[in-house]
Structures are given as C-alpha cells and as structure tokens.
Interface confidence: low
C-alpha cells in the first residue's frame, strides 16, 4: 500500500519577511519522526501521531519546503513551494525637462527597483490618469519609457510612474505602487520680438507710459518681462489676456540720462529670450521765462523785457527771435499809459531729432499813471427834463484806478457816476466831476440843465 | 467737444460697495489717462489712481490701494471706479478727470458723482 | 510722497488790488499745475508747466516760479476771481494737490 505525506498549505504566498505555520501529515501508521527540509528558519510547535506543525519566520525569498518520514522502511515525501511577493521599494520618475517646447518630443522615464515576483509586476506611465505605456519590469532595476509629444494640455499636467503587483490569481489582490508625481511645464514663445511702444522723445524729470507686447505667448503668465531705459530698469505691471502679455510701466528720464537712450523690452519664457528696443531721445527744455525789468512801471520809465531759456532753445518774445538759439531775446520801451496791461509773448523752439517742440510764456506790465477822465464818455453839459430817470455816463480812467466823484458847487451835494438816478430841478446847476487816485487828482466841469416839468 | 459725464450720486449703507461710472466722448477714450480724485464737503482735492485705457495699468495712492479698484472699457468708452468696505470716511463727491498730457494736466473734469455712507 | 503747502490758507482781496499766493513743495518739482474751484464746481485747469494760461483764463493771471517755490498772480482782482485755487505736481506718484488758497471778495 501507497502512503502519503502531506504539506500544508500548499504553494502559500506571502509578502517577504513574513511567517508561516505549516502541517506535515501522514497516513502512514508509523510514528517516524516528520523533518521539515528547508534552509528558512524553522521552529516545531507541536508533533503527534502521524503529523508535525512548523512554525517558518522571516520568510523572505521564494523556497520550496519538504517534508520527509520515514515509513515501512521507505520514505515518503511531500513539499510544497512559498511564493514571496514583495511590492517595489523604489518607484520613481525621472525628472522632466523644467520647460519643453509645445510640439517637441520628450522622454518620460521609470525606474522601478525590488518587487516580486517580476512575473507578476508591470510598469505604467501615466499623464493624469490616462495610460501612456504599460510595459513588465524585466531587469534590475526595471526603466521603462515612453517618448511623449508635448502639447499645450500637458502645461502643469501631472505625470507619474505606477507599478501594479498582479496576485489576484492567489486570491491576494493588485498591489499598486505610485510614484511622486511631476508636473510638466511646456511653452510657446513666437520667434517674432515684442511690440514696443515708447515716447521718441521724452523730457527730464517728466513721465510718459510704455507698453511692450507680444502675442502667441504660452502660458503667458509665466513669462517673466524685464523693461528698462538705459541701465535704469522700469517698475512694471505685466497684465496678460489670453496669449498675449502686455507690460506697462511709466518712464521718468533724469536729467543725467539726457541724449540718446534705449528703450529695452525683454521677454523670457522656458528659458528662451526675446527682445525689442526703441531708440528714445532724453531732452531737457527750461523755460521760457519772461521777465521785466519792472513789474510795475512809472508812465515814461523805460521798461527791458527778456525772455530766456534753456541751452540750445531758440526764443522770440513778441516776434523778435533771439540773435541765436541758447541767448535771450529782449525789447525796451518808454512806458506809457497804452502799455498798461500791456502782454509780452515769448515763445521757445528747441528741435529734438529733426522735431520743433514749443512752449510759450507771457508777461503782463502794469504803468502807473495818474488819473484822467475822457472827455468823450463825459457830456460837459446835459439838457434833462424834471423827474426823469437818467445815468451820468462818465469814465475815469487811470493805474491805480482812480475814484470817480461829482460834487455840485458849493454844496456837497453828489450825484451817482453810471448808476440811474432819479432827476428834478434841485440837480440843476454845475457840477465838479473829479478822478482822484495816489498819483493825482483830473477835474471836468458837467453843466446839469434841467428843464422844469411841463403839465400840459 | 470733449465731455467726461459720471453717474448720479449714490446712497450706501457702511460696509457696502458702489460703482461709478464715468463716460468719455468728444476724444478718443485709450489714447489719454483717466484720474480719479476725492473730495470731501469743505476739504481739498485727494488723489486716488489713474488707469491707462489702453492698457488696462492702474496705479493708485497707497491710502486708497485696498479702497478704490479702477476699471475701464473700451467698447463704451467708459471708466469705472468702485468702492468697497465703505465707511463714513468714504463720503465725498468724486471726479474722474481727464490727464492731457503734461503741457495741459487734468485738463477736462467731470461733474463729479456724491457718495454718502450712512446707516 | 511730495507734500504741497500752499499759504495763505484763506484772503481777501478788493477788486483793482494786486493777489498773489504761494506754493511750496516738500522737494523740488520740475512743473506746478493751477486749478481753479468755485462752490458746487468742478475744479478747472488754470495754469499749466508753471506759467502757462488755460484756454478761456484771464491775462490778469499770471505763475511763476521753480524747484520747490511757486506763485499765482492776479494783477488787479476782479469779483470773478473769487474762488479756491489748488496747486498740483505729478513728479512722483502720488500725485498731490495743495491744500488750497480760498480767495474771497473784501
């Protein structure tokens, strides 16, 4: 008769370093001691008639296990083979490229290191969760790739490795390993340089805007825009809408960059560059200043008017140019009373690059001159009629304006100068009209004839 | 001729927002600055920012960094300007103005919109 | 920021008398602006680049001045001129205005 010896549990995975209880057992009669062969640590717990419980610890490589006893003077066997699975301790993407052009290829690489059995490990790349390549692990450590075409959808797209341990044919389930994900950066940055646009001319200490734009950028919010005049870097505001970046910023000449200068707009994405430059011009342009030798003027002094400006300026006050751009114009003339309020206009040219800017300035004299009342706004005698309403229309003129007073002859009595009155008959008679200021008083005689109201 | 009109005056209650509106004609909207200024009953002229309708860049006075929020659109010509977290200190009439360039200043204003915050 | 002081804060002045007030910049300025503010108004530009006269304003106005000091004069005052004036600069941001001179009819 045949017996057997049997070994249980029979072909047992399990995951490395664990342990596991085995039972030999025979249904031959004899009481033959049962060995457990194997080079893993072993311990017997328990033994009886026929059979022997072993106890395997920190299993942590595939074995093959037998048992062994002896029976009617033969030997039987049995055995049994531990699978060890074993998840990757390694899972890891290689670093991707910190930018990639949109339209070019690059390699996503894996590198998968332990894990058992191979037989049962696969290697997936993945961009989301969308599989790229699905590939086994092979060697030791396992690298798989896969060339992906870059595209705008994969900017900030997540890439990552997984590995997937398949022990569901032993009933244990799929052991998934993910790696550390890594974002990709891709780009777009036309070979085109930006649009510039900037002051030809701008004047010290003044402030103008320049905008620098370039379309077809992507993502336009990760470029990085650099905008200077001269060596003096701008202060700008980067506003993007769509792929198209516009940088702002408002430029301040001083006055030690006057002359010619550069405009630079630098616009850097993925670590490519480009650029424009404007030529702008710095000028300086004082003035004009107009002055007089005396604000204020005595009627018959003589007065100068300059007028000035800065260097390379060409004047010309009240028509008459400077003898040369640079020198200041001027004009005398013997105050008079027509000059009172009189303006003097200057006005500057400077050419900056083949273009004339002008300016202009003026200058108001005041003469003093005494008092005058003009005879031909003033009636020396008036015909009225009794209880009429009328106006004494008489003007004085003068700097400073004088006071305007008609007094009746001896009496002090005062009629209103251009404000109507009521008139009657006590009005009639001679008047003093008088003008008075600091610098004098102007007498006119107004003979007030008024004519007795009539009833019928 | 050129005409900055801004919308009518407006009645908040603390803590709330408003915008006003102010609508450019007579000149051509992205080409010129457009300011904004406050001033309360009694007081000077303040400062608030400018916007470049061209551009959409705002610069402000810091006092008003996280007050005013100026805005512009092309289409209508028409800058905006609002207000938020509005306090009793925010009741002013407010005036966008027109920047002509330095040879002429804030050179067209308009006339003004009133903003009271009262509970 | 550039603080404008502009004084006197408040005068008055009868018509034919000669105004003038002042505007002084906490650091110099290449280029003042007046603006001129009557109750219930919008300010209106006055003076430009210092010295310049805004279209429609009298000959009788006139500004002067440089680096940090700036004047407006009137030469002889007339009842319409009665109004508030404000200085401006905008060499740096902020821009600022004076606090204003009010010129009132005596």
């Known amino acids: 008769q045949e017996f057997l010896l049997r070994v249980e549990p029979q072909n047992p995975v399990l995951s490395a370093g664990g342990s596991l209880f085995v039972n030999c057992s025979t249904d031959c009669p004899s009481s033959e001691k049962i060995a457990l062969e194997t080079s893993l640590s072993k311990e017997l717990v328990a033994s009886g008639m026929g059979w022997a419980a072993f106890n395997l610890s920190n299993v942590t490589g595939n074995s093959r296990i037998l048992c062994s006893v002896y029976c009617n003077g033969s030997q039987i066997t049995g055995s049994s083979n531990i699978t060890v699975y074993g998840l990757p301790e390694r899972v890891e993407l290689a670093p991707l490229p910190p930018w990639q052009p949109v339209g070019q290829n690059f390699t996503l690489r894996c590198q998968v290191e332990g894990g058992s059995p191979r037989t049962s490990l696969t290697v997936v790349l993945l961009r989301w969760e969308e599989e790229l390549s699905r590939q086994p692990a092979v060697e030791e450590p396992a690298e798989v790739t896969a060339t992906v075409l870059a595209s705008r959808d994969d900017h900030g797209a997540p890439f990552s490795c997984r590995t997937e341990l398949d022990m569901q044919p032993q009933g244990l389930g799929l052991f998934v390993n993910t790696s550390a994900p890594r974002q990709l950066r891709t780009f777009v940055l036309p070979v085109t340089p930006p649009r510039l646009v900037a002051p030809r001319f701008l004047e010290v200490e003044t402030s103008w805007p320049v905008d620098c734009t370039l379309d077809g950028l992507f993502p336009a919010s990760e470029a990085q825009v650099y905008l200077a005049l001269g060596d003096q870097m701008l202060n700008a505001t980067v506003m993007n809408h769509g792929d198209t970046l516009t940088a702002t910023a408002t430029a301040t000449a001083r006055a030690d960059q006057e002359g010619a200068r550069e405009i630079v707009c630098n616009v850097t994405l993925g670590g490519e560059r480009r650029e424009a430059r404007e030529n702008l011009t710095v000028f300086s342009f004082l003035g004009p200043i107009v002055n007089l030798s005396e604000p204020t003027a005595h009627e018959g002094s003589t007065v100068t008017v300059s007028c000035m400006a800065g260097a390379r300026v060409q004047v010309t006050l009240d028509g008459v140019p400077a003898a040369a751009p640079g020198q200041t114009a001027q004009l005398q003339l013997n105050a008079t009373e027509s000059d009172d309020g009189r303006s003097f206009f200057c006005s500057a040219t400077l050419e900056v690059d083949g273009e004339f800017l002008h300016r202009n300035s003026s200058v108001q004299l005041r003469v003093l001159y005494g008092p005058k009342i003009d005879r031909a706004t003033c009636p020396q005698h008036l015909k009225w009629k009794d209880k009429t309403r009328h106006v004494l229309q008489c003007q004085a003129r003068g700097n400073p304006y004088p006071e305007l007073r008609c007094l009746k002859e001896g009496s002090s009595r005062e009629v209103p100068v251009g404000i109507p009155f009521f008139v009657n008959v006590t009005h009639n008679g001679t008047y003093q009209c008088q003008a008075s200021s600091s610098r004098g008083k102007y007498t006119l005689v107004v003979v007030m004839d008024i004519e007795a109201f009539s009833s019928h | 001729q050129v005409q900055l009109q801004q919308s009518g005056a407006e009645l908040a209650k603390p803590g709330a927002s408003v915008k006003m509106s102010c609508k450019a004609s007579?000149?051509?909207?992205?080409?010129?600055?457009m300011h904004w200024v406050k001033q309360r009953p009694g007081q000077g002229l303040e400062w608030i920012g400018y916007?470049?309708?061209?551009?959409?860049?705002?610069e402000y006075n810091q006092r008003f960094q996280d007050k005013a929020t100026l805005t512009a659109d092309k289409s209508s010509s028409t800058a905006y300007m609002q207000l938020s977290s509005l306090t009793s200190e925010d009741s002013a009439v407010y005036y966008c103005?027109?920047?002509?360039?330095?040879?002429?200043?804030?050179?067209?204003w308009g006339q003004g919109t009133s903003v009271t915050v009262s509970s | 920021q550039i603080v404008l002081t502009q004084s006197p804060a408040l005068m008055s002045a009868s018509p034919g008398e000669k105004v003038t007030m002042t505007c002084s910049a906490s650091?110099?300025?290449?280029?003042i602006y007046w603006y001129q503010q009557k109750p219930r108004s919008s300010p209106k530009p006055w003076i430009y680049?210092?010295?310049n006269l805004a279209s429609g304003v009298p000959a009788r106005f006139s500004g002067s001045g440089s680096g940090a000091s700036y004047s407006l004069t009137i030469s002889i005052m007339e009842a319409e001129d009665a109004a508030t004036y404000y200085c401006?600069?905008?060499?740096?941001?902020?821009?600022?205005f004076g606090a204003g001179t009010k010129l009132e009819l005596k």
């Open positions: 103005a027109r920047w002509g360039g330095n040879s002429y200043g804030l050179d067209y």
């Open positions: 007579g000149y051509t909207f992205t080409v010129y600055w």
């Open positions: 916007i470049n309708p061209n551009t959409d860049y705002t």
């Open positions: 650091s110099s300025v290449s280029y």
């Open positions: 680049l210092t010295s």
């Open positions: 401006q600069q905008w060499k740096s941001i902020p821009l600022t």
